[in-house]
């Protein structure tokens, strides 16, 4: 068409997909009467009439725009609804009078792509591949026009680099006219890239300006051979017998090699393989002093049959041996002295403490306990505690019982027991002394003796309450080589006036405390005797 080259540049109208484009016919009054205008769409240089304006009234032409066009602004503006990517073209309005003039509008359509979806290569990448390998794929769906992709590694943009970095992008057009972009990042990675964070960024334009969307960050599995193997022990710090100890083999390769953990046999000096659990961890539970020694880890790279050895690691399981006390079973006369000596072995320096068993009172800090002017009350338990101050919880103890020679000592001298006639009494009597006494009763009945400890005895007597017994009472006598001693039990008949308010049973129970370091009791229990058979 002659003179077409002098046409002014079309007016640019930018709009997002799905919204309404307002196409304002920019003809001046001198160029044409806006009450008589034809609208055309231009696609591949072919004009198609899409809308007529006559006397200010609009009429759509049949075709793709038939349902989406309307007049606005007293006929000066054509509104195109539900814009699609296919609407990106030139629209022109042509005035008919006074002479044929036209005004061109370039419609630009935009659509932000969806969030980019990044997929890492699940198979991973070996470090010494000869050419770039696929690291990840980035997909940006439904954008218009085609967005630009930028790949990042650790926050820095990646550039194409021969034999090192290659970015391969392609796009497909959806039926909607929108574009889906796929970009594959290929790279040659090094061992240090095992923790590298990769992501892709889509850059796109909207009427409001330039925008971008970032994918999530991903790391790619990087495979590299093991160069170093080492052992790690948990817990860290001083170990003691009884602890749960884990020895694990670690390597700087990926995937980890096949491991074995060995301990050096101290006598043969051979490395003997230890049995590890399914995770390749050697668990010592409970740890014993025999677990101390030299451990090492061997790793095999089965791809090359290369075997690697860790530096040996010395493991020390600290211990305290059984505690020995001498003399082991001390016996002393009243008024004499005694020296108790405590011994133990340990992998560390030991501290000793002597405690009184009954009270937990600390008597001495050190391995030797000296006792002077021994009284009967000094008899009983003494505990030696051997502990390692630098390792809390590492200690062993040994109890020794001191016996003081002396005649029997009764738990009580005398006491009252409430009874009923014809009941079977269960009487008990306790005595202590060294040598341990024996107990006898002054009445007939069923007696049984029970040793409470090396110096203490408890005798129990079952006896029927008779009028004679009520009169005489019961005596128990304890005797040993050094003398004898007696306790008396007075029997008192129960009647309604002697029953206490809370006595709702026919059993009266009486307890007496007599010994300075033992508790003793005497009980009476009623048992009804069978009634005589009635004779007919």
């Amino acid at each position: 068409v002659p003179g077409e080259a002098e046409q002014p540049a079309p007016e640019l109208v930018e709009v997002e997909v799905g919204s309404t484009a307002l196409l304002k016919c920019g003809l001046s009054q001198s160029q044409g009467n806006l009450s008589h205008v034809d609208w055309f769409s231009v696609h591949k240089e072919k004009r198609t009439l899409i809308f007529r304006v006559r006397q200010g009234q609009g009429q759509s032409e049949p075709g793709e725009y038939e349902q989406r066009l309307s007049l606005q602004d007293r006929g000066a503006t054509l509104a195109l609804t539900q814009v699609t990517p296919q609407d990106e073209r030139i629209f022109l309005c042509q005035g008919k009078r006074p002479r044929s003039q036209e005004y061109r509008i370039q419609l630009r359509v935009y659509k932000a792509p969806e969030e980019p979806n990044i997929q890492v290569n699940p198979l991973g990448i070996p470090v010494n591949s000869k050419e770039p390998e696929e690291v990840a794929t980035c997909v940006g769906r439904n954008g218009y026009p085609i967005p630009q992709v930028i790949w990042y590694k650790n926050g820095r943009p990646l550039k194409e680099e021969k034999n090192r970095v290659h970015i391969q992008s392609s796009q497909t057009v959806e039926s909607s006219g929108l574009y889906t972009l796929q970009s594959i990042l290929k790279a040659q990675l090094v061992k240090e890239d095992k923790d590298a964070q990769f992501y892709c960024e889509l850059n796109y334009r909207l009427p409001s300006g330039n925008h971008m969307k970032e994918s999530r960050e991903v790391t790619v599995p990087v495979f590299y051979p093991t160069e170093k193997v080492w052992l790690e022990v948990e817990p860290v710090g001083m170990l003691k017998e009884g602890d749960r100890v884990e020895i694990r083999c670690l390597a700087d390769g990926n995937p980890p090699p096949h491991f074995s953990i060995s301990k050096q046999n101290p006598s043969t000096r051979e490395a003997e393989e230890e049995t590890t659990n399914d995770n390749g961890v050697l668990v010592l539970e409970p740890a014993r002093k025999e677990h101390s020694g030299r451990y090492e880890c061997q790793a095999w790279n089965l791809d090359t049959m290369i075997s690697l050895l860790s530096e040996p690691q010395e493991l020390l399981v600290n211990y305290v041996s059984d505690v020995r006390v001498s003399p082991a079973a001390p016996e002393r006369q009243e008024g004499s002295s005694l020296t108790l000596t405590c011994e133990a072995e340990s992998s560390q320096d030991l501290e000793f403490q002597w405690l009184r068993e009954e009270t937990d009172q600390v008597l001495e800090r050190g391995p030797v306990l000296q006792l002077h002017d021994l009284k009967r009350e000094a008899g009983g338990g003494y505990r030696c505690v051997a502990s390692v101050p630098s390792i809390p919880g590492l200690n062993r103890t040994q109890l020794v019982k001191l016996a003081i020679f002396g005649p029997p000592w009764m738990a009580f001298k005398e006491r009252k027991v409430w009874v009923k006639e014809n009941m079977v009494l269960n009487l008990s009597c306790e005595a202590s002394g060294h040598p341990r006494p024996t107990i006898s009763w002054n009445v007939n009945g069923t007696a049984s003796e029970q040793d409470q400890d090396p110096q203490r005895v408890l005798s129990t007597l079952n006896v029927l309450v008779t009028p004679e017994l009520l009169e005489t009472g019961v005596e128990c006598t304890a005797s040993n080589d050094l003398g004898k001693n007696t306790s008396i039990l007075f029997l008192e008949l129960v009647n309604l006036t002697t029953l206490t308010p809370d006595s709702n049973t026919t059993t009266g129970l009486s307890t007496s405390t007599a010994s300075p370091h033992t508790r003793a009791n005497s009980t009476s229990t009623e048992r009804k005797l069978p009634e005589p058979e009635s004779r007919g």
Epitope: P126, S129, R269, E270, A271, D303, T304, I306, S307
Partner: antibody, heavy 120, light 112 residues
Framework: EVKLVESGGGLVQPGGSLRLSCAAS????????MSWVRQTPEKRLEWVAT????????YYPDSVKGRFTISRDNAKNTLYLQMSSLKSEDTAMYYC?????????????WGQGTLVTVSS | DIVMTQSPSSLAVSLGERVTINCKSS????????????LAWYQQKPGQSPKLLIY???TRESGVPDRFSGSGSGTDFTLTISSLQAEDVAVYYC????????FGQGTKVEIK
């Protein structure tokens, strides 16, 4: 018959580079672990590098780590040793070797060797 | 690193005589689980490349004459040629593969 033929040796100045090649035939090259072993003028043998059958795993002793690179092209049945920052102590006869299918690292087959001399 | 020490460094033996070469490792090469030692022996005849003789300390490579035998365990190993033949003149090397790979310095066998 297993055949390993080394090439690429020669005289090179200290600090220089050299690339050795080993052409393999008579076996399925891509199935075997390959290594380079060198022999010094004093007749000492020293392992130099090992590569897995697929080429993804490589190993070196500390004496050459970071200076030598072993690689392979299974399509061409060829093993390579790229040597850089060469030192006089790298002077040796370099042998290309093939492992065997034992559960232990052995150099079952050896080439005839190629001589590398590092000297100014 | 594991150091391999061979002794003697050379020896001259009459044909038909027994030859014993020792190899000592700076640490045990025994894998206690499989009860095998990571030790191999190689032979290098004059002007030739080395050749594998024995692996696992005592297993002969196929084609190796039975006059060659390997023994020992842990740190001390021996290569024995029961009756020296003229074609056995060579340098013999031991090699460990317990931790990476190291060779002994070699033992030269000559005919007296």
């Amino acid at each position: 018959e297993v055949k390993l033929v080394e090439s690429g040796g020669g005289l090179v100045q200290p600090g220089g580079s050299l690339r050795l090649s080993c052409a393999a035939s008579g076996f399925t090259f891509s199935s075997y672990i390959m290594s380079w072993v060198r022999q010094t003028p004093e007749k000492r043998l020293e392992w130099v590098a090992t590569i897995s059958s697929g080429g993804s795993s490589t190993y070196y002793p500390d004496s050459v780590k970071g200076r030598f690179t072993i690689s392979r092209d299974n399509a061409k049945n060829t093993l390579y040793l790229q040597m850089s920052s060469l030192k006089s102590e790298d002077t040796a006869m370099y042998y290309c070797t093939r492992d065997d299918d034992y559960d232990v690292k052995v150099f079952a087959y050896w080439g005839q060797g190629t001589l590398v001399t590092v000297s100014s | 690193d594991i150091v391999m020490t061979q002794s003697p460094s050379s020896l001259a033996v009459s044909l038909g005589e027994r030859v014993t070469i020792n190899c000592k490792s700076s640490r045990s090469l025994l894998n206690s689980r499989i009860r095998k030692n990571y030790l191999a022996w190689y032979q290098q005849k004059p002007g030739q490349s080395p050749k594998l003789l024995i692996y696992w300390a005592s297993t002969r490579e196929s084609g190796v004459p039975d006059r060659f035998s390997g023994s020992g365990s842990g740190t001390d190993f021996t290569l024995t040629i029961s009756s020296l033949q003229a074609e056995d003149v060579a340098v013999y090397y031991c090699k460990q593969s317990y931790n990476l790979l190291t060779f002994g310095q070699g033992t030269k066998v000559e005919i007296k």
